[in-house]
Each structure stands twice: as C-alpha cells, then as structure tokens.
C-alpha cells in the first residue's frame, strides 16, 4: 500500500491472535444464524487474495443496521490500515457478482480457516 504524502508498510507478521479472534466471530455468526442474516442483504463478492481484509470490509461496510455483523466490521477495520466507507469501490470486488451476507461470511470463514491452518496470519 502506498499513499501520496505518507508512508504505508505491511509491518511484521503478527501472532495468530487477531486472525483467531476473527475466525471465532465468523463461526459465532454462522452458528447463531436463525433468520436470514442481515435480512438477506446482498454484498459484492470479493477475490480472496492479497488485500482481502480491506476488500471484505469495503464490501460489508455497505450493510448498515445489522448488529449481527458489526463486530466483524470492526474486526476487519483492525486489519485494514486505510479508511473504508460505505459506497467505496475496490478493484478486488468481483464487479458483477453480489451474494447474500450469509454466503459471504461462510466463504470468508473457509478461506481464513485455510490461511490459519497454513500459518499465514497476515
């Protein structure tokens, strides 16, 4: 990440604490899901690649008034060092694909579990 007038760096690879907490929260959401998550709101699908945390936040931040994912939105902001706001568009979104929040959370959870198993905490 680079930014005019400033300097951004990826920093050292952190311990697994933060990733584990995020995974636990996503597990919690999927297990406690009764009615459709966030009333079946749709969000942009993302490429689960480098920059995924910011892209996931940019997608989920467009869902407002859904207390079930507020903690996840906050946690993702703790992974993403630049400012994210509703309406923002990331090149990491799959432009023509929208999916339900519940599916988005499941896909993200599967990918994060894979990263955790492989020891890729950053």
């Amino acid at each position: 990440l680079t930014c005019l007038g400033g300097f951004a760096s990826p920093g050292p690879v952190p311990p697994s604490t933060a990733l584990r907490e995020l995974i636990e929260e996503l597990v919690n959401i999927t297990q406690n899901q009764k009615a459709p998550l966030c009333n079946g709101s749709m969000v942009w699908s993302i490429n689960l690649t480098a920059g995924m945390y910011c892209a996931a936040l940019e997608s989920l931040i467009n869902v407002s008034g859904c207390s079930a994912i507020e903690k996840t939105q906050r946690m993702l902001s703790g992974f993403c060092p630049h400012k994210v706001s509703a309406g923002q568009f990331s090149s990491l979104h799959v432009r023509d694909t929208k999916i339900e929040v519940a599916q988005f959370v499941k896909d993200l959870l599967l990918h994060l579990k894979k990263l955790f198993r492989e020891g890729q905490f950053n």
Epitope: A8, P12, A18, R74, G78, F79, C80, S85
Partner: antibody
Framework: QVQLQQSGDDLVLPGASVKLSCKAS????????INWIKQRPGQGLEWIGH????????YFNEMFKGKATLTVDTSSSTAYIQLSSLSSEDSAVYFC?????????????WGQGTSVTVSS | DVLMTQTPLSLPVSLGDQASISCRSS???????????LQWYLQKPGQSPKLLIY???NRFSGVPDRFSGSGSGTDFTLKISRVEAEDLGVYYC?????????FGGGTKLEIK
C-alpha cells in the same frame, strides 16, 4: 471501561533509542487502530502514524520515517512506538489514541501521555 | 501536506457568551471515498486531548449540545453556544483525509 495506559516518563541520552508502550484494556484491541501523536512542550499536536493491530500494517507521517517504528503485541493488547537516534527535537509528550471505524476513524480514547526528555 | 490554519490563536470570552473558532485547510479535505474526516478536540492543561466532534458535525457521545461543528471543503467552524468554565482550554481541528494527517495550530479559549 476503555483505557489506554502508557508507560512512565523517560529521560534518555542523545543518540539513544527509547521504546514507549500503550496497554489497552476494556475493548477488543485488534478491532481499533492505534495512533501516535507528538506534542512538544508548549506546542501543538503532530500525528506520527497509526497501526492496524490485526495486520500490523502502518501508515506514517513521512517526517517520522526512520525515526519511529510502530508495533503491537496482540497477546498483551499493547502497542509500542520505538524512537531512534534521539535528539533534543524529540523531547516531547507522546500520546497513543485509538480510532473507531464507526466514528469515522476519530480518536475517541487517548492515553495519558509519556514524556520523553532527551538530555545529556 | 495539508496545512490546517486555525483562527483566532486566542479567544477571550465571558462565561455564557458564544464562541466561534475557524479552521481552514490548504486544500480540500474530502477523502477519495467522499467523506470529510474533520474532527475537533479539546485539550485542557496537563490532560490528553478529548474528542468533541467527528466528521465535521457529529457530536461525540457525552459532548454537550452547546458544541456544534459545520463547514465543507476547506472551511470549517466550531461553535460553542454558551461558554462554561469547563470549556476552557485549547481547541484543535484535525484532518484525517490525507496522509499525513494534520492538526491545526490550536485556539486557546480563555476568560476575558
């Protein structure tokens, strides 16, 4: 309740380094950015940079590149700033403050500040 | 870097008066995502700064409604409708739209 507890005041020699800490409690540490701000005696405030604790990624004020290093220890919910090659210009109070995405990244809670005095 | 210029430097007021502090940025502080990350902080002697206003006009929880923020683009204002003794201190505007984020030079609110 949310608290950011900073390490005690420090007197250091010119040319030395110092590492200041900011221990967070009362909230999920990895969900909020930590900013560092400098205030020289009788002067205004200067933003040094921030760190996203979940990833360890940082944004810096170019003026402090090479001077300040920001890190976190998520297991102890503590943020650190290391200041190197200290000179009298670095004598200041250093604050840590967290940013909340739901307050448009405003700095809603601040530490009490750590005073660093560089003197021989 | 974005220069934030506050006026006046010192603002002597009588308790109960209205106070107005101006903050001008050297360029637009509208972020690329469309938001204006302009905040106001109050620092009392020997204390850490405290958040008053975020995103130009939103009051932080617990901040009395006598504090209000307004403005857009490059021109911003903090108003205190009826100054109380606890309001005295140094007020700083802050832009978080462009790195490096920058503070204004401060305005000292004091008793006339």
């Amino acid at each position: 309740q949310v608290q950011l507890q900073q390490s005690g005041d420090d007197l250091v020699l010119p040319g030395a380094s110092v590492k200041l800490s900011c221990k967070a409690s009362g909230y999920t540490f990895t969900s909020y950015w930590i900013n560092w701000i400098k205030q020289r005696p009788g002067q205004g405030l200067e933003w040094i940079g921030h760190i996203a604790p979940g990833s360890g990624s940082t944004y810096f004020n170019e003026m402090f590149k090479g001077k300040a290093t920001l890190t976190v220890d998520t297991s102890s919910s503590t943020a650190y700033i290391q200041l190197s090659s200290l000179s009298s210009e670095d004598s200041a109070v250093y604050f840590c403050a967290r940013s909340d995405i739901f307050l448009s990244y405003a700095m809603d809670y601040w530490g009490q500040g750590t005073s660093v005095t560089v003197s021989s | 870097d974005v220069l934030m210029t506050q006026t006046p430097l010192s603002l002597p007021v009588s308790l109960g008066d209205q106070a107005s502090i101006s903050c001008r940025s050297s360029q637009s502080i509208v972020h690329s995502n469309g938001n204006t990350y302009l905040q106001w902080y109050l620092q009392k002697p020997g204390q850490s700064p405290k958040l008053l206003i975020y995103k130009v006009s939103n009051r932080f929880s617990g901040v009395p409604d006598r504090f209000s923020g307004s403005g857009s683009g490059t021109d911003f204002t903090l108003k205190i409708s009826r100054v109380e003794a606890e309001d005295l201190g140094v007020y700083y505007c802050f832009q978080g739209s462009h790195v490096p984020y920058t503070f204004g030079g401060g305005t000292k609110l004091e008793i006339k």
